[in-house]
């Protein structure tokens, strides 16, 4: 977890004199507890926005938007911490909106929003705009919670963003797989336009069952620069094993931005299909 | 312009089956994780379940886990909710939304964010 361009960070709006500052997640008001506290955020949304470094990358980021209720709290209300937990790892990160100048009321209702909170590819995030000052401990709560589920390098947006592309994304490698004669398996799949190795992941199932029957690894050597974009062709021999006839086929890249942590792509052949068979009728009648 | 066309309601007998269906136009489909969400007679709007752009993840309400189940047609631009073992109190319009942001908002944290586009379809359990 961080935040995108961190001095490019402000809260500041008409009538209102705010800063951003970096926050422990521990605000001052949980230890020392104040007598009058605002009220909860209202109509807290998190979208999924994508914003571009100074450096052209693109990166996914979390964009939070909240108003505040329309009561005199406001009176009492001295900024706003968000927090991004990140829900696999708890990691937490958190920032302070300090508001330098007193709230008043006006002819709309108030609206704040940040658009820092770089966000992960296929992670889930619980994002939490809680007002300071933070209640007392029996207080009603003032904070706003919600979950957010980022796509991952598949979904066409977060595709072209940079960890995403650093990951591989761009790459189809089309893969085909058929099966021949003699217990083997033909994969055909379209080079990258890089000169880097890859790998074949065989891994073959019973019918109706997930426990692998046979596994198989096939190294495929850096191609050449006329090589690229064209088509592999390997064929691979399985064990000769009844039933054991679903086969998924994987191919692990290793290209230079990603190593051995690149997206891989796979395919899967099924069994083939049983036909049924009737019981034959006989065509004579047994006496006995 | 969003457009969500819900289908498949009626009247059952409690313990009988339902499927529900939706279908959209007005907006890439199969970048968008979509929920179904409900209202009893009387009441507010309830979540029911969600589903994410892919089908890779999926959310239900706690009280209809294993009762209901979602899933979605992206070349066909449908989502569906199939509904068995129904109960009275499972009597509301249903609604399909799509989630307000190309991620997911998930655990139906984001019912108060939902909008609301089609006209529903009337789901009635009663004997």
């Known amino acids: 977890l961080r935040l995108l361009d961190h001095r490019a960070l402000v809260c500041s709006q008409p009538g209102l004199n705010c800063t951003v500052k970096n926050s422990t997640c521990l605000d001052d008001s949980w230890i020392h507890p104040r007598n009058l506290t605002p009220s909860s955020p209202k109509d807290l949304q998190i979208q999924l926005h994508f914003a571009h470094t100074q450096q052209g990358d693109l990166f996914p980021v979390a964009h939070i938007e909240w108003t505040l209720q329309t009561d005199a709290s406001i009176l009492y209300l001295e900024g706003a911490e968000l927090s991004v937990l990140q829900l696999n790892t708890n990691e937490r990160l958190c920032v302070r909106f300090e508001f330098l100048s007193k709230l008043r009321h006006h002819h709309r209702r108030w609206r704040f929003t940040f658009s820092h909170f770089v966000v992960d590819p296929d992670q889930e995030y619980e994002v939490t705009v809680h007002h300071l000052p933070k209640p007392i401990p029996d207080g009603d709560p003032n904070h706003q919670s919600k979950n957010f589920l980022v796509p991952d390098c598949e979904h066409a947006r977060m595709k072209v963003t940079t960890p995403c592309m650093s990951s591989g994304s761009l790459w189809d490698p089309n893969i085909t797989v058929e099966t021949l004669e003699a217990h083997q398996l033909r994969v055909s799949f379209t080079l990258w336009n890089e000169s880097t190795h890859y790998q074949i992941l065989l891994t073959s199932f019973p019918h109706m069952e997930n426990h692998s029957c046979f596994e198989h690894m096939h190294h495929i050597p850096a191609p050449r620069p006329e090589e690229f974009h064209q088509r592999s062709n390997v064929t691979l021999t399985l064990r000769n094993l009844k039933g054991c006839c679903r086969h998924q086929v994987q191919i692990q890249p290793f290209f230079s931005s990603c190593l051995n942590d690149c997206l891989r792509h796979s395919a899967t052949v099924s069994c083939p299909e049983m036909p049924d068979t009737p019981e034959p009728i006989p065509d004579y009648m047994p006496l006995w | 312009e969003v457009q969500l066309v819900e289908s498949g309601g009626g009247l059952v007998q409690p313990g009988r089956s339902l499927r529900l269906s939706c279908a959209a136009s007005?907006?890439?489909?199969?970048?968008?994780?979509m929920h179904w969400v409900r209202q009893p007679p009387g009441k507010g709007l309830e979540w029911v379940s969600g589903i994410s752009w892919n089908g890779g993840r999926i959310d239900y309400a706690d009280s209809l886990k294993g009762r209901f189940t979602i899933s979605r047609d992206n070349a066909n631009n449908s989502l569906y909710l199939q509904m068995n073992s129904l109960r009275a109190e499972d009597t509301a319009m249903y609604y399909c939304?799509?989630?307000?942001?190309?991620?997911?908002?998930?655990?139906?944290?984001?019912?108060?964010?939902?909008?609301?586009r089609g006209q529903g379809t009337m789901v009635t359990v009663s004997s």
């Open positions: 939304v799509k989630d307000p942001s190309l991620g997911y908002c998930s655990g139906g944290t984001c019912s108060d964010s939902f909008d609301i």
């Open positions: 007005g907006f890439t489909f199969g970048d968008y994780a």
